[in-house]
């Protein structure tokens, strides 16, 4: 058993351009806190997977208010270490996630709001009992500087905290086959292995394979609290014969609350008030819970489906991640069909469809002429998703409902005069021009640039355009 310790040295803007804006403002003061999550081995595990080695939350840092116009400095940090106790052997190789959280202290209904500022992750090799290791990690424009170490809790020693040490029985040397415990040369290695299942909290052994109980506990594995039912007094150390308690210390003696929990006596036994980041009857369960407010962007927090996951954030559409902290670029999935333009409005996804297509995802190809009649003998033409009418002579407009003024567009060139006719228009050309639209000049020698005019028409006569 032992403790992984993390010391945050600084959190602030990283080097280079693009310094981040301060996360706090005069209108919205805030403070930082940190969360560390440890997993055994060097696997590239997702942030969502359980913190199998343990997790811890720091205290809240001092309240910080940005000075207007000043760049974001290194932000004030919480006091103290983050400590993650581990019960079994230290694995030697581990993965870590360190999250920097901001607690906004504005006038929030229902308490303060939390948001994730930065998350760094890494994989490291580390021997227990070694010196502090220093590290720098960057997340976007932010930089986190920290140190960490793993140390064994007595009587465990060694790079994995699996060897046990105990004081020498003789001043000069250790017993047969036992080595001195480096670096504690005045102690000897203890090859004791207690009975399998012996309670690590309430049992101990002086001979291999035995399980001796601490006061107040009984049973072959020291997991059974001593009964008080047949005793006169409700507390005290056990009598070896009766298993009864005689007057003595109370249920909070020795503080049964782990991880800095405070103990208070109750009529039935005791109660632990746990620090943030721990819960359970003895504050023995580490990790963030729904009470810590881990979900963002409208995510709702419910309990995890298994004991290892203390919470699950159910994210609304548009967000994902274990804390609903990641905005989904829903347009990257190209949901709009037939060339529609995708718009992610945050609360909804919209497709702006090209002409001739409709539906939430532009999936419907419109039959443009269906149910559409072109008036006055016009015919409907489909094309490019847009409906169009080809109108009979003398009619125009989208549905051929408008009587056309064929002269409105001034169709006669070179000063020719336009006359409306029941079947179209007639251009009366100015001298020197001819053609249906008076578009051709008459040559000076009297020959036209076109083949000869039809019989009965002289150049300069009005030409009817059919």
């Amino acid at each position: 058993a032992g403790v992984f310790e993390l010391q945050i040295h600084s959190f602030g803007p990283g080097p280079g351009p693009g310094a981040p804006r301060s996360p706090c403002s005069a209108r919205l003061p805030c403070r930082l806190f940190f969360r560390v999550c440890l997993k055994p081995g060097l696997s590239e595990e997702a942030a969502e997977s359980p913190c199998a080695l343990g997790a811890a939350l720091s205290a809240r840092g001092p309240v910080y208010t940005e000075q207007p116009g000043a760049p974001a400095p290194d932000l004030p940090l919480p006091d103290g270490l983050l400590q993650v106790p581990f019960r079994d052997a230290w694995p030697g190789t581990f993965s870590f996630i360190i999250e920097t959280w901001r607690e906004e202290l504005g006038d929030q209904i229902g308490g303060p709001a939390w948001s994730l500022l930065a998350r760094v992750a890494g994989r490291r090799r580390l021997a227990a009992g070694g010196p502090w290791a220093r590290d720098i990690q960057r997340a976007g424009a932010w930089e986190l500087r920290f140190s960490y170490r793993a140390r064994c809790e007595p009587p465990a020693v060694g790079t994995a905290c699996t060897r046990l040490c105990r004081p020498r029985s003789a001043p000069s040397r250790c017993g047969p086959g036992l080595r001195p415990c480096a670096p504690l040369e005045d102690e000897c290695e203890a090859p004791l292995v207690c009975r399998a299942g012996c309670s690590p909290e309430h049992g101990f052994c002086e001979q291999p394979g035995e399980c001796r109980c601490l006061e107040g506990w009984t049973g072959p594995l020291c997991t059974v609290p001593v009964s008080t039912s047949s005793c006169l007094s409700p507390r005290g150390p056990s009598s070896a014969t009766t298993g009864c308690l005689v007057p003595g210390p109370g249920p909070c003696d020795g503080n049964p609350c782990a991880n800095g929990g405070s103990c208070s006596e109750t009529p039935r036994s005791f109660e632990c008030t746990c620090p943030r980041g721990f819960y359970g009857l003895r504050c023995e369960v580490s990790g963030v819970t729904c009470a810590d407010g881990p979900c963002f962007n409208g995510g709702l927090c419910v309990g995890g489906a298994d004991p290892d996951s203390a919470y699950i954030c159910h994210c609304p559409p548009g967000f994902q991640g274990s804390n609903c902290e990641k905005r989904v670029d829903r347009c990257s999935l190209q949901p709009c069909r037939n060339g529609g333009l995708c718009l992610d409005l945050g609360h909804a996804l919209r497709c702006r469809c090209r002409a001739g297509f409709a539906g939430p995802r532009c999936e419907h190809d419109l039959d443009d002429c269906a149910g559409r009649a072109c008036a006055n003998g016009g015919t409907c033409v489909e094309g490019g998703g847009a409906h169009r009418c080809s109108c009979a002579l003398g009619f125009g407009g989208r549905d051929c409902r408008e009587r056309a003024d064929p002269c409105a567009a001034r169709p006669c060139a070179h000063g020719g005069r336009c006359y409306a006719h029941f079947s179209g228009l007639v251009c009366a050309c100015a001298p020197g021009y001819m053609g249906a639209r008076c578009e051709f000049p008459v040559h000076p020698d009297g020959a036209s640039a076109l083949p000869a005019a039809p019989p009965g028409l002289r150049p300069g006569d009005p030409q009817r355009y059919l």
């Epitope: 209904i109 308490g111 303060p112 810590d292 409208g298």
Partner: antibody, heavy 121, light 107 residues
Framework: QVQLQQPGAELVKPGTSVKLSCKAS????????ITWVKQRPGQGLEWIGD????????NNNEKFRNKATLTVDTSSSTAYMQLSSLTSEDSAVYFC??????????????WGQGTSVTVSS | DIVLTQSPVTLSVTPGDSVSLSCRAS??????LHWYQQKSHESPRLLIK???QSISGIPSRFSGSGSGTDFTLSINSVETEDFGVYFC?????????FGAGTKLELK
């Protein structure tokens, strides 16, 4: 201050539908889930479902899936619950409540006064 | 569905008494347990969230404790305005459920 306004009472006939309203004020309507809770006379509270105004997403109690339909109108900051195929079992007081939502807190911090629905021919 | 059992059903007390109301869950709800007070002909009011977190505007005489399946709402020195029905509610899993309530009445 936060307020959720509900009409006092609705008298409806068996087999018909009724649409209950819940008008919110005093906070950002689109940022907080709204939940609906049923309370029959002299009895406990039953959760019906929640709706997130910004997206219209819902969580539903299976028991009420074919009974209650939750909607919102963000322009008027109003949440609605339509109850269909009404029977005498649906006679109850229906509360809307605001969910804290900040940090994911699934807790009802402000409640409407409730609408009393009576189903009678 | 998680069933929340509240006891006692009715508690008769005199102003000034200190009382404890119990809420027991049919399976662990971790610390996702909240308490509400409902007075006659009124809507419920949030008292305590997440087992022991206080709510602004709620008197400090109300406190909560417990973990897993057993929870307690304590009222230190009951006042006349405290009479009504108290409900516990879990948000550990869907569907959200409430206890049947404990009625705190004047002795």
């Amino acid at each position: 201050q936060v307020q959720l306004q509900q009409p006092g009472a609705e008298l409806v006939k068996p087999g018909t539908s009724v649409k209950l309203s819940c008008k919110a004020s005093g906070y950002t309507f689109t940022s907080h889930w709204i939940t609906w809770v049923k309370q029959r006379p002299g009895q406990g509270l039953e959760w019906i479902g929640d709706i997130y105004p910004i997206s219209g997403s819902t969580n539903n109690n299976e028991k009420f899936r074919n009974k209650a339909t939750l909607t919102v109108d963000t322009s008027s900051s109003t949440a609605y619950m339509q109850l269909s195929s009404l029977t005498s079992e649906d006679s109850a007081v229906y509360f809307c409540a605001k969910i804290i939502t900040v940090g994911g807190a699934y807790v009802m911090d402000y409640w409407g006064q409730g609408t009393s629905v009576t189903v009678s021919s | 569905d998680i069933v929340l059992t509240q006891s006692p059903v009715t508690l008769s007390v005199t102003p000034g008494d200190s009382v404890s109301l119990s809420c027991r869950a049919s399976q662990s709800v971790r610390n996702n347990l909240h308490w509400y007070q409902q007075k006659s002909h009124e809507s419920p009011r949030l008292l305590i969230k997440y087992v022991s977190q206080s709510i602004s505007g709620i008197p400090s005489r109300f406190s909560g404790s417990g973990s897993g399946t057993d929870f307690t709402l304590s009222i230190n020195s009951v006042e006349t305005e405290d009479f009504g029905v108290y409900f516990c509610q879990q948000s550990n899993s869907w569907p959200l459920t409430f206890g049947a309530g404990t009625k705190l009445e004047l002795k």
